[in-house]
């Protein structure tokens, strides 16, 4: 899973923001469920979907200079 | 079908420069906003970079701040990763994955199949 160090309780976001809960910051709410991918073919293994929400949790985040 | 190719992985000596490119079909990327995750060998998923959907939000984790560039072409419908002095420590599968949001939060939606990135002298 993804989970880093203890991180503090999700803060309240805006209305027009989502809280992230891998980089630990509220940013704008963007494309809502992403499609899931058909099944793959036999000869490539079917891609990742959706880490459980509860296990989404990151390190440390930086917001860039 | 949604589809995410990552490419630019390879080995390379420490504190050389590396570029991983994911090219993205199959959804509307430009309101998407997306991650770059890894897994080094034997350990679990490391979250190491987001970018908005129009760059205007971008965050590190702090083991690759200063060192490495997100960024995202919304024409080509491709994420970027720009690698700098790279470490043994980056050696991972890199994936790109896109931001599924819903009930107020966001998370990892739909992953690469990866590539791999080899730091070693």
């Known amino acids: 899973s993804l989970r880093g160090r203890d991180a503090p309780a999700p803060t309240p976001c805006v209305p027009a923001e989502c809280f992230d809960l891998l980089v630990r910051h509220c940013v704008a709410c963007g494309l809502l469920r992403t499609p899931r991918p058909k099944p793959a073919g036999a000869s490539s293994p079917a891609p990742r979907t959706a880490l459980q929400p509860q296990e989404s949790v990151g390190a440390g985040a930086g917001e860039a200079a | 079908e949604v589809q995410l190719v990552e490419s630019g992985g390879g080995v390379v000596q420490p504190g050389r420069s590396l570029r991983l490119t994911c090219a993205a079909s199959?959804?509307?990327?430009?309101?998407?906003?997306m991650y770059w995750i890894r897994q080094a060998p034997g350990k679990g998923l490391e979250w190491v970079s987001y970018?908005?959907?129009?760059?205007?939000?971008?965050y590190y984790a702090d083991s690759v701040k200063g060192r490495f560039t997100i960024s995202r072409d919304n024409s080509k419908n491709t994420l970027y990763l720009q690698m700098n002095s790279l470490r043994a420590e980056d050696t991972a599968v890199y994936y790109c994955?896109?931001?599924?949001?819903?009930?107020?939060?966001?998370?990892?939606?739909?992953w690469g199949q990866g590539t791999t990135v080899t730091v070693s002298s």
């Open positions: 970018i908005s959907s129009s760059s205007s939000t971008i």
């Open positions: 199959g959804f509307t990327f430009s309101t998407s906003g």
């Open positions: 994955v896109t931001q599924s949001c819903g009930a107020g939060k966001c998370y990892p939606g739909v």
